[in-house]
């Protein structure tokens, strides 16, 4: 069954954590649907964003952080491993120095830590997707 | 009760028709939710778009048409009558020479016809909103 979108979950992250998302774009790529994943510092949606990951399907991916309410330097990628009309599985792994984003098992994007991942308190998944699975897994100590 | 989003309805338009939409942004304006309304020439979402109306809440509105699969000259407005966190009522009236867009009863945008409104077969309302009302009214002859 489908999860509600926007999907918001209280979460704690650290090196070894992985966030897994399975979903499908709600429109054809010609119409440029979006997917957005935000790692927030508070349970409030207005809070700062440690890692902002936004896909404009078929066009580009932008990554950024929002610090003290202001967007910082945007990182853009034209890499587009998502398939038009197809389900995707996205996993974001917390490495010691960066986030590694895998799409359908393929390493696709990285984003260097600007704020420590331990600052994350909430993950939000939203925009133009249907969501079938969400998980946060923690590496065994 | 809420209507499904994306919301797609078969529609015929002509001078005197009005499309009315009532809804609410799904996120605070800081997070830049979108609203999009597209008047399509076919029941298929890949079809051409006679009138494309996209709000990036808190930032700007863009209007355009998609003809033979290609986007044409974009019209942009910084006018932002929508209120953060508030319900809105949007009405798009078909005038002889243009579309007139009213927001909460206030004339806010216009877009000159590029393709005759009689070419419209479907209206789609989508992106980051909850939708409580959709109506197409026809002026009595």
């Amino acid at each position: 069954s489908l999860l509600p979108v926007p999907y918001t979950e209280a979460a704690s992250l650290s090196t070894g954590s992985t966030v897994t998302i399975k979903g499908r774009p709600l429109a054809c790529f010609l119409n440029e649907p979006y997917l957005q994943v935000d790692f927030h510092t508070e349970m409030k949606e207005e809070s700062d964003i440690v890692f902002h990951f936004q896909v404009c399907f078929g066009r580009r991916v932008v990554m950024n952080s929002r610090e003290y309410g202001a967007w910082k330097q945007q990182v853009e990628s034209k890499n587009m491993p998502f398939q038009d009309g197809q389900e995707f599985e996205l996993s974001i792994s917390v490495l010691p120095d960066k986030y590694q984003v895998m799409v359908n098992g393929q390493s696709s994007y990285t984003f260097d830590h600007r704020i420590k991942p331990e600052a994350v308190k909430m993950v939000q998944v939203w925009r133009d997707i249907s969501l079938t699975k969400f998980n946060v897994s923690y590496l065994k100590r | 009760s809420l209507l499904p989003v994306p919301y797609t309805e078969a529609a015929s338009l002509s001078t005197g028709s009005t499309v009315t939409i009532k809804g609410r942004p799904l996120a605070c304006f800081l997070n830049e939710p979108y609203l999009q309304v597209d008047f399509h020439t076919e029941m298929k979402e890949e079809s051409d778009i006679v009138f494309h109306f996209q709000v990036c809440f808190g930032r700007r509105v863009v209007m355009n048409s998609r003809e033979y699969g290609a986007w044409k000259q974009q019209v942009e407005s910084k006018n932002m009558p929508f209120q953060d966190g508030q319900e809105f009522e949007l009405s798009i009236s078909v005038l002889p020479d243009k579309y007139q867009v009213m927001v909460n009863g206030q004339s806010s945008y216009t877009f000159d016809h590029r393709i005759k409104p009689e070419a419209v077969k479907m209206v789609q309302v989508w992106r980051d909103i909850s939708l409580t009302k959709f109506n197409v009214s026809y002026l009595k002859r």
Epitope: T8, K133, N135 | -
Partner: nanobody, 121 residues
């Protein structure tokens, strides 16, 4: 108020079977995932099995092929069928659900109180 109540634990001989149940009750808007964890004396709590909203599952390597997790969406209940039990399966088994309670804007994790499973001859 959301509550998770486990049942089905007990004493069983090696090679035997048990079926654990965990029922989530209260005003629940949506369930994201439900899982079983266990904690043996002097050890850390570890994931045993988890079932997601798309009905996909994941298992700890040590229980693969012996344990089966399933879920009744209608009853907000998760089950753990444990076959070919071994003494090293002895632990307190806890249920965890990530769900959104009515009136809340976010999903959060909830734990049950645990049920004891002892595998011994």
């Amino acid at each position: 108020q959301v509550q998770l109540v486990e049942s089905g634990g007990g004493l069983v001989q090696p090679g035997g079977s048990l079926r654990l149940s965990c029922a989530a009750s209260g005003s629940i808007f949506s369930i994201s995932r439900m899982g079983w964890y266990r904690q043996a004396p002097g050890k850390q709590r570890e994931l045993v099995a988890i079932i997601f909203s798309d009905a996909s599952t994941d298992y700890a390597d040590s229980v693969k092929g012996r344990f089966t997790i399933s879920r009744s969406n209608a009853k907000n209940t998760v089950y753990l069928q444990m076959n070919s039990l071994k003494p090293e399966d002895t632990a307190v088994y806890y249920c965890k659900s990530v769900l959104r309670a009515a009136g809340y804007g976010y999903f959060n994790q909830y734990w049950g109180q645990g049920t004891q499973v002892t595998v011994s001859s």
